[in-house]
């Protein structure tokens, strides 16, 4: 049979030939009638046989972590007979490690982020060394670490890699290490291999630190004129945090006046102070105000960096404008009665400079043929009014300052024209009436109302009468309905065309003013072709003819 | 898992040389215990080993292709290519890489191949 | 070199059939060092068996290898028609690598 013992050769030999091991027949008896064959990948150019003995030897330097086993092939021939010995068998050359492999890292670039202030012991991250050597072999592929640089903020567990925290750090003081770290085999034992990485950890913020006002005082200047809201300045408070962290907001914490608000600016960090309510330089020409600022975001955890909000004082100087002369009431109303002569006091208006020097004041009336202001704001007429032509009048009163011309201010002067009674009632028509020839006495023949143009106090009450003449002929009677209307009546029996075919009546038309006035109002009554019947059809045919200026036969 | 990718030309003219590249993807081609091969398949034929190399460069190529064959590995990139030179139509193949288990000799896994034609 | 050849050149055979397919190499070869792949049209080929009867990962058990010395074999006990296709072994035992011609199992 076949005698041998388990091949092992050291890899990374440097000689030209290194013994591995003997193959040999149990049969052999040394006397070189048998020939040993060595077959298979590696027979010839990574191991030869003494074909006499059965030696093997290595003829070139191998590398385990390439291949770490050869399975070979082995014959045995006898010589003399061509035949062979033994049966043709496996073996197997393993390669023994050494350790020629230093531990690599093989995820570098390493980078961390760890928010600052972060207790000791906190994880930051586990680096990893690989080594190629064979972890089954001795301590070659075991490994420690060790911290190079990091200390005193970092530690690093030596048989996991784990970097840990083991000082709290400021990142308002420094925001990022280099860490490097050490692998090395054989457990660091004597002739151990190392390996470094770098480690750069970034700390990330945490909102330890509260915004303050570098500035205690702010001075700022408003004018008088600026319209609510406006800008006036801006305020800034420096936080040593970043991000949100950083995130601040301003606010108004004193003002008695309430005159000012904060807004914050959020991309710039800055508390613009806008104006609230608008100033006025003659009431007041400074404010102070007291502001604060706190950040946006903040943890409870973190509440005792932010107790105390910082403050400063702002001191906010009002500048003066000269202003436009400004009136006593926003708007006027005056009255007037109608026919009054021209001349005739209206009212005065009232305006002053608001400024301190108080420029003495000049009025005038824009576009207007009936009234006058003079320079004591004394508004009279230029003509006489009539309430029926125009009842109310709309004036632009327009004051300027004597030194600045150029400061103006205009207000409405509503000016009512009332009411006198000048205007007597009469018809709210014209009347043309018709009666047929054979009406009868009491028949009415045409209903009458009035109209005043004057403006009624109460309500209008008209009085209808005939005239005394009218009265008199008693053809046709007037009987008022006491409601501002009246109805003409026949006061006979029959009309007769031919004899008299048309009638006019004088009618009276008086009002209820003080004193009454009295109207003369002419109704024209037609005496109409009618037939036997009465017929009102054929009666309003030929009233319609005669309206129509027509004659009917 | 360990993935790979050829990439290259497709056409190659008789008398240049092909340049192939592999690129290793879930792994690192520096892992021991493996070599990188290639292999190829003339049209409706058999499996023809080229050769392979092991990260640290030590290469082993088919003796008929020796004089036209170099691998080379770039560790940096996880990449090995294939450079055959004087190409002739005869060289018209499906060219594939593959890792090979160095103790054991087996292809696994294998890239998708690439088709490279030579002709003028 | 180790000449492996693979018969028979071509295996007609059923769904539901077993399927026997035989590598013969020209010189001894380590069992340890034998291998199978089966490749399908435009694919790339990929391992079945290594060290002659060790199933590769994710290999269904109705494929199996025996065989030492000079002649193996790779038996499918019950054919599914995704088993078509050709099937190569290939040798480690010796320098340079090769492979067999392959034999295809087409559907009968």
């Known amino acids: 049979g076949w005698v041998w013992n388990q091949f092992f050769v050291p890899e990374e030999m440097n000689t030209t030939s290194h013994h591995v091991g003997r193959l040999r027949s149990d049969l052999d008896n040394g006397n070189n009638s048998f020939q040993y064959k060595l077959l298979g990948a590696g027979a010839g150019s990574t191991f030869i046989i003494d074909e006499r003995t059965g030696d093997i030897y290595a003829i070139e330097k191998l590398d385990r972590e390439e291949r770490s086993l050869y399975i070979l092939r082995a014959q045995v021939i006898d010589i003399t007979t061509g035949r062979a010995v033994e049966p043709e068998s496996e073996f197997v050359i393993k390669v023994s490690d050494i350790n020629d492999n230093e531990p690599k890292f093989l995820d570098e670039p390493y980078e961390a982020i760890v928010p600052e202030m972060s207790p000791e012991g906190t994880l930051v991250i586990q680096v990893t060394a690989s080594d190629a050597d064979d972890p089954s072999s001795g301590n070659n592929a075991r490994l420690l670490y060790s911290l190079l640089q990091g200390q005193p903020y970092f530690s690093v567990e030596p048989t996991t890699g784990v970097i840990r925290i083991s000082s709290k750090m400021d990142r308002e003081l420094q925001d990022e290490y280099w860490v490097i770290i050490q692998a090395k085999d054989m457990i660091g034992q004597p002739g151990a291999l190392s390996g470094t990485t770098s480690v750069l950890i970034k700390l990330s913020d945490v909102n330890d630190n509260k915004p303050i006002f570098k500035e205690s005082l702010y001075r700022l200047t408003v004018s008088e004129s600026a319209p609510t809201g406006t800008s006036i300045g801006t305020i800034m408070a420096y936080d040593n945090d970043i991000g949100e962290n950083a995130e601040m907001d301003y606010s108004i914490e004193e003002d008695d006046s309430q005159t000012f608000d904060i807004i914050t600016n959020h991309e710039t960090q800055e508390g613009i102070v806008i104006l609230k309510k608008k100033v006025n330089f003659e009431h007041q020409n400074h404010y102070g105000i007291r502001a604060k600022v706190k950040n946006h975001h903040v943890d409870e955890q973190l509440m005792k960096y932010h107790t105390e909000a910082s403050t400063t004082f702002i001191k906010i100087q009002v500048e003066d404008v000269d202003e436009p002369p400004l009136f006593l009431l926003p708007y006027y109303i005056f009255e007037i009665f109608e026919e009054t002569p021209q001349g005739s006091f209206v009212g005065v208006v009232s305006a002053t400079d608001p400024d301190n020097r108080k420029s003495p004041i000049r009025y005038s009336i824009t576009r207007s043929k009936v009234f006058n202001i003079d320079d004591n704001g004394t508004i009279t007429t230029t003509n006489s009014l009539d309430r029926e032509i125009s009842a109310w009048y709309n004036l632009s009163i327009t004051a300027t300052e004597k030194y600045n011309i150029e400061q103006i201010s205009s207000i409405p002067v509503y000016v009512q024209v009332l009411n006198i009674n000048d205007h007597a009632p009469e018809f709210s028509q014209y009347y043309e009436s018709y009666v047929c020839e054979n009406a009868g006495s009491g028949q009415v023949i045409q209903t009458i109302s009035a109209v005043d143009r004057d403006e009624s106090i109460e309500e209008h009450h008209f009085y209808f009468n005939l005239s005394v003449e009218d009265t008199n002929s008693s053809s046709f009677t007037i009987i008022d309905n006491q409601d501002n209307t009246a109805v003409i009546l026949t006061n006979r029996t029959g009309f007769n065309l031919q004899e008299e075919p048309i009638f006019y009546i004088s009618i009276l038309i008086a009002d209820n003013g003080i004193p009454s006035l009295t109207s003369t109002n002419t109704l024209t009554i037609h005496v109409c072709d009618c037939d036997d019947s009465g017929s009102t059809q054929t009666c309003q045919y030929q009233e319609l003819m005669l309206s129509m200026g027509f004659k009917t036969e | 898992q360990v993935q790979l990718q050829e990439s290259g030309p497709g056409l190659v003219k008789p008398s240049q040389t092909l340049s192939l590249t592999c690129t290793v993807s879930?792994?690192?081609?520096?892992?021991?215990?493996?070599?990188w091969s290639w292999i190829r398949q003339h049209p409706g034929k058999g499996l023809e080993w080229i050769g392979y190399?092991?990260?640290?460069?030590?290469?082993y190529y088919n003796p008929s292709l020796k004089s036209r064959v170099t691998i080379s590995v770039d560790t940096s990139k996880n990449q090995f290519s294939l450079k055959l030179s004087s190409v002739t139509a005869a060289d018209t193949a499906v060219y594939y890489c593959?890792?090979?288990?160095?103790?054991?000799?087996?292809?696994?896994?294998w890239g998708q191949g690439t088709l490279v034609t030579v002709s003028s | 070199e180790i000449v492996l050849t693979q018969s028979p050149g071509t295996l007609s055979l059923s769904p539901g059939e077993r399927a026997t397919l035989s590598c013969r190499a020209s010189q001894s070869v380590s069992s340890s060092y034998l291998a199978w792949y089966q490749q399908k049209p435009g694919q790339a080929p990929r391992l079945l068996i290594y060290?002659?009867?060790n199933r590769a990962t994710g290999i269904p058990d109705r494929f199996s290898g025996s065989g030492s010395g000079t002649d193996f074999t790779l038996t499918i006990s019950r054919l599914e028609p995704e088993d078509f296709a050709v099937y190569y072994c290939q040798q480690y035992g010796s320098s340079p690598l090769t492979f067999g011609g392959g034999t295809k199992l087409e559907i009968k």
């Open positions: 190399i092991f990260y640290r460069g030590r290469t």
């Open positions: 879930g792994g690192s081609i520096s892992s021991g215990g493996y070599y």
């Open positions: 593959a890792r090979v288990y160095s103790n054991y000799g087996w292809f696994d896994p």
């Open positions: 060290g002659t009867s």
